[in-house]
Interface confidence: low
């Protein structure tokens, strides 16, 4: 299958914006983001804006992707206690409307 130079250039540019530890499979498939390694550092909940779970069978491992307040995305291991605590905290924040 031929790929035009413009498309190839576009793909290369897009690749530079994929966060560290994250990868996206071939665009022919449905877009899925996977984590291939986890942060080995606890992230303070004060710095977190949101999270999403990665459970797709297309990915090598289950993961949580935290988005920080400055839009940086970080892969974390959902089996670690601090990750569970952080998800709980963000869930509570979402449930409690700010007055």
């Amino acid at each position: 299958m031929k790929v035009s130079a413009a498309l190839l250039c576009l793909l290369l540019i897009a690749a530079t914006f994929i966060p560290q530890g994250l990868a996206q499979p071939d665009a022919i498939n449905a877009p899925v983001t996977c984590c291939y390694n986890f942060t080995n550092r606890k992230i303070s909940v004060q710095r977190l804006a949101s999270y999403r779970r990665i459970t797709s069978s297309k990915c090598p491992k289950e993961a949580v992707i935290f988005k920080t307040i400055v839009a940086k995305e970080i892969c974390a291991d959902p089996k670690q206690k601090w990750v569970q605590d952080s998800m709980d905290h963000l869930d509570k924040q979402t449930q409690t409307p700010k007055t």
Epitope: K42, I43, S44, V45, Q46, R47, K72, K81, W82, D85
Partner: antibody
């Protein structure tokens, strides 16, 4: 750091902390105090952009933390001062990691004495 | 808010090893990073350990930080004690309400 001194209970005082040697607008900043012969007590934090401010319960509603990026200066406006506010006040730079709150650079401290 | 509890004072002879504990009253010690500060008399605090067990550049490897989930505490261990290590040591962490928490401080005397 400047602005410390002797003040009567109920009065106000404003502390200043002039920062240099780093990009002030990129870092969160804290105020931490230490009463005579006592331990360190966190007072307040302001985030790098000035949009988020948090206070210890003991000063909430009386103290206001602020910053002026154009002057590279951190402030602590202290109102309704009490005898128990007597302490050395330190400004401290936040580590400003994504990962935790901590202090990595400290000012030399300024003394506030609240006494009638 | 949780509290961080430290021994009021510890003492040891030069050349020996001393450990200062910092116990978290509620919540997991492993959920948030712990920092350790040294404060010599009449001086501002300086960081000796950050992120549980990391040493800033310039801090000798005689200073070692760790956390122990079973006792829900952090520890600062100083080996090969020197007279200049005599100071107050404070642990510090933070909670999910954007509050910073300090331990009460431990006075280290090098006999």
């Amino acid at each position: 750091q400047s602005g410390g001194g002797v003040v009567q209970p109920g009065r106000s005082l404003r502390l200043s902390c002039a920062a240099s040697g780093f990009t002030f607008s990129s870092y969160g900043m804290h105020w931490v105090r230490q009463a005579p012969g006592k331990g360190l007590e966190w007072v307040a934090v302001i985030w790098y952009d000035g949009n988020n401010k948090y206070y210890a319960d003991s000063v909430k509603g009386r103290f206001t933390i602020s910053r002026d990026t154009s002057k590279n200066t951190l402030y602590l406006q202290m109102n309704s001062l009490r005898a128990e506010d007597t302490a050395v006040y330190y400004c401290a730079r936040d580590s400003s990691s994504y990962y935790y709150y901590g202090m990595d650079v400290w000012g030399q401290g300024t003394t506030v004495t609240v006494s009638s | 808010n949780f509290m961080l509890t430290q021994p009021h004072s510890v003492s040891e002879s030069p050349g020996k090893t001393v450990t200062i504990s910092c116990t978290r009253s509620s919540g997991s010690i492993a959920s948030n990073y712990v920092q350790w500060f040294q404060q010599r008399p009449g001086s501002s605090p300086t960081t000796v350990i950050y992120e549980d067990d990391q040493r800033p550049s310039g801090v000798p490897d005689r200073f070692c930080g760790s956390i122990d989930s079973s006792s829900n505490s952090a520890s600062l261990t100083i080996s090969g004690l020197r007279t200049e290590d005599e100071a107050d040591y404070y642990c510090q962490s933070y909670d999910s309400s954007n509050h910073v928490v300090f331990g009460g401080g431990t006075k280290l005397t090098v006999l």
